[in-house]
Interface confidence: medium
């Protein structure tokens, strides 16, 4: 999916008002310096591509993020403010519902969510030069 035509300011507002708090809740008890940010993004569409991938694609050691509250809200924001996104994702979502996994918080998941926090922060500061 091409995130170029999303309403970035509305997605930013949704992040600031709800998604950010859920990410913090998920990471509670973890030191902010515990994980190094290894995933980066260069502009807002790229950031959303990376955010979608880390949030919804199962990875080795972390298969359970999609049912977390921050993920559900991310999905909502993308569905509402990215034209056509819900149509491209609905089949994948229905397939996911058929094979619901038990939510397990692993160290790998914590690391992945730490990366997500960095991507969201970058999304909110699109004019900063890439380090």
């Amino acid at each position: 999916y091409d995130f170029t035509n999303c309403d970035f300011e509305k997605i930013k507002a949704a992040y600031l008002s709800t998604i950010s708090k859920d990410l913090i809740t998920y990471m509670s008890g973890t030191k902010s310096t515990e994980f190094n940010n290894t995933v980066s993004c260069s502009n807002r569409p790229h950031c959303l591509t990376e955010i979608q991938s880390l949030t919804f694609n199962p990875t080795a050691g972390c298969a359970s993020l999609a049912k977390e509250m921050f993920a559900m809200k991310t999905k909502a924001a993308l569905a509402i403010w990215c034209p056509g996104y819900s149509e491209t994702q609905i089949n994948a979502t229905q397939a996911m519902k058929k094979r619901r996994k038990r939510k397990v918080t692993t160290n790998k998941c914590l690391e992945q969510v730490s990366q997500l926090q960095g991507l969201w922060r970058r999304f909110n500061r699109p004019l900063l030069k890439q380090q």
Partner: nanobody, 114 residues
Framework: EVQLVESGGGLVQPGGSLRLSCAAS????????MGWFRQAPGKERELVSA???????YYADSVKGRFTISADNSKNTAYLQMNSLKPEDTAVYYC????????WGQGTLVTVSS
């Protein structure tokens, strides 16, 4: 099949109040997010407010402090309490659930005029 039925609209004077209802069927209501959208003549449909299964809410800047979204999971119904209505709130109001952004109901017309 997902079905959404909106009600509660009408004509109200500026400063007045209305409470919209959205009766939903075809899924487990409490497992999803739900949003109220509106579409004014000649404008795009926009999100007014959303509520999530953890009870947290989202409001568009234009309605913050005036509108309140809520849900009664036992009745599979969501509500939008609209206070201090303004003429610019005039629109057809729709509810939507999770991915089902193509399953729009008929909507309910809210007209704010003196």
């Amino acid at each position: 099949e997902v079905q959404l039925v909106e009600s509660g609209g009408g004509l109200v004077q500026p400063g007045g109040s209305l409470r919209l209802s959205c009766a939903a069927s075809g899924f487990i209501f409490s497992s999803y997010w739900m949003g109220w959208f509106r579409q004014a003549p000649g404008k795009e449909r926009e999100l007014v407010s959303a509520i999530f299964s953890d009870g947290s809410t989202y409001y568009a800047d234009s309605v913050k402090g005036r509108f309140t979204i809520s849900a009664d999971n036992s009745k599979n119904t969501a509500y939008l309490q609209m206070n201090s209505l303004k003429p610019e709130d005039t629109a057809v109001y729709y509810c939507a659930i999770d991915w089902y952004l193509n399953s729009w109901g008929q909507g309910t017309l809210v007209t704010v005029s003196s």
